[in-house]
């Protein structure tokens, strides 16, 4: 039996009750709400420990948020016949700590995947490519949302978290069609060197609220479609000439740099000159110095070369602690 359940959608959702008989393919799984008209299934805040096996084949939008899934195994969504229409999958806040290789295989229409707010201690290199071949079949993913997936320190593997995420993004060159990538709030200290080179279709990249200190080894050169680059709330001290030239060379990009601890010394001169003439940076008039102390809260656009000096390096015999 199914009872109507309130929903913000205009289509009615049917809440399923568990039954002794196996459900027909178009019935709604236990603990879920379904709308065939909206092609949507919501299994939200139900403490599910695994993905329901009896998802209706019409599902286009699947919400599995606020559960206790822990592990997403290979073929977690593999069904026969396949869930061929599933285009948007939201798994945020479901206490996932492990996503295994091939977890999203047999979702041939999957365009948007949200794994945010899961403490991923293990993300398989083949989570998105599905196979360990050097070149995999292209993933259909267009939007990949991985905000706040960093695990607590005591759950981290030995290898770097940045490296683990990067390996999953580049494996098999499967994500060449990705347009949107959100990696906000992940405590990233650096961006692995070759990641962006493998994501040539990116239009939107969000790296905000991380701990990025430098972009020296990051190349944006081949991101010719990039429209938005979010670098707010990081630990950036200065952008060097190579980075400035690459950003200026991107035809459509808008860069967001608010709330970084800019160091306004002699190394900042090129960036200030660039800021004054570029149209690339959004809200550039809000950018202010954080260091040195005498420059705190000065607006970068108002600085001139005389303001940007470096203390002479003292010989060791004259240095004090």
């Amino acid at each position: 039996t199914s009872s109507a359940s309130s929903s913000s959608s205009s289509a009615p959702f049917l809440a399923s009750a568990a039954s002794a008989q196996p459900p027909l393919p178009d019935q709604c799984p236990a603990l879920c709400e379904c709308s065939e008209a909206a092609r949507t299934v919501k299994c939200v805040n139900r403490n599910l420990t695994e993905v329901p096996t009896d998802l209706p084949l019409y599902v286009r939008n699947l919400f599995l948020t606020g559960n206790q899934l822990a592990v997403l195994p290979a073929g977690a969504f593999a069904r026969r016949p396949p869930l061929a229409e599933l285009a948007a999958l939201n798994l945020s806040g479901s206490r996932l700590d492990e996503v295994r290789g091939g977890a999203f295989e047999h979702l041939p229409s999957l365009r948007q995947l949200d794994l945010s707010h899961n403490p991923l201690a293990y993300l398989s290199p083949f989570a998105f490519s599905g196979s360990n071949a050097s070149i995999s079949a292209p993933s259909p993913l267009v939007e990949l949302i991985l905000n706040h997936i960093v695990p607590p320190d005591d759950k981290r593997q030995n290898r770097s978290f940045e490296g683990m995420v990067a390996a999953a993004l580049v494996a098999g060159r499967a994500l060449q069609g990705l347009h949107l990538l959100e990696l906000a709030s992940n405590h990233f200290l650096y961006l692995p060197r070759d990641v962006l080179a493998q994501l040539p279709s990116l239009r939107y990249l969000d790296l905000s609220n991380n701990s990025l200190v430098s972009l020296t080894y990051v190349s944006f050169r081949n991101l010719t479609h990039l429209e938005s680059l979010h670098l707010e709330d990081n630990a950036l001290k200065v952008l060097h000439n190579g980075t400035l030239a690459e950003l200026q060379g991107l035809p459509h990009v808008r860069v967001f740099l608010d709330n970084n601890p800019w160091v306004c010394d002699c190394h900042m001169a090129d960036m200030v000159t660039w800021l004054k003439q570029t149209g690339v940076v959004q809200g550039k008039d809000r950018l202010t110095c954080a260091f040195p102390e005498k420059m705190r809260n000065r607006v970068l656009l108002e600085l001139n070369s005389a303001d940007l000096d470096c203390d002479p390096i003292l010989p060791p015999s004259l240095q004090t602690s």
Partner: antibody, heavy 127, light 112 residues
């Protein structure tokens, strides 16, 4: 190239069990289902069930649920089907087949079928 | 279970003739996502079945264009425009939409 290898024949006694194998090669074993099909002499085909090696999850035809058990060993890319409490009704040829996406010239992501088949294992139940 | 009824059971033809095999399902096998998982397989003597047609009307790679599939809902047809000697064997329709998946009883194509 894709291959599914099955032993040719098994002779078993009534009441006993038999475990037959289907060794896959030439593709990523964990990414395609293995389907099992029964064919009695001079009769048609029956779908027994299938298993997805990536997760080990099996689906069964209700008719065969108490008869067949499907398993896989991913380390050797081999699928197994065990048949228990055998009777003469179980004498048949058992085929394994690969089920999954068809990579054809026309790219249709919804195109799935059983595209490769093993040669079949002939099971004879006789005392 | 979805019953797949094939007709005729036996189809004697002359080489070069057209052959037509019908398959009818006891209920619609159009799935809720709009796909119809209806396939045709050919089993030649002493061999395993081979895929000919998937999703009602799509020829599998390597299958000659003299084979065509059509139909919708519950009624489906396999046509062979000009029968050749290598086409002889038993043809099975198969529905992969509803568990348990089921085969038709088979149609034996033989020389007149």
């Amino acid at each position: 190239q894709v291959q599914l290898q099955q032993p040719g024949a098994e002779l078993v006694k009534p009441g006993a069990s038999v475990k037959m194998s289907c060794k896959a090669s030439g593709y990523t074993f964990t990414s395609y289902w293995i389907t099992w099909v029964k064919q009695r002499p001079g009769q048609g085909l029956e779908w027994i069930g299938d298993i997805y090696p990536g997760s080990g999850r099996a689906n069964y035809n209700e008719k065969f649920k108490s008869k067949a058990t499907l398993t896989v060993d991913t380390s050797s890319s081999t699928a197994y089907m065990q048949l228990s409490s055998l009777t003469s009704e179980d004498s048949a040829v058992y085929n394994c087949a690969r089920y999954g996406p068809l990579f054809t010239t026309v790219v249709d992501p919804n195109s799935y079928a059983m595209d490769y088949w093993g040669q079949g294992t002939s099971v004879t139940v006789s005392s | 279970d979805v019953l797949m009824t094939q007709t005729p059971l036996s189809l004697p033809v002359s080489l070069g003739d057209q052959a037509s095999i019908s398959c009818r399902s006891s209920q619609s096998i159009v799935y809720s996502n709009g796909n119809t998982y209806l396939e045709w397989y050919l089993q030649k003597p002493g061999q395993s079945p081979k895929l000919l047609i998937y999703k009602v009307s799509n020829r599998f790679s390597g299958v000659p264009d003299r084979f065509s599939g059509s139909g919708s809902g519950t009624d489906f047809t396999l046509k062979i425009s000009r029968v050749e000697a290598e086409d002889l064997g038993v043809y099975y329709c198969f529905q992969g939409s509803h568990v348990p998946f089921t085969f038709g009883s088979g149609t034996k194509l033989e020389i007149k």
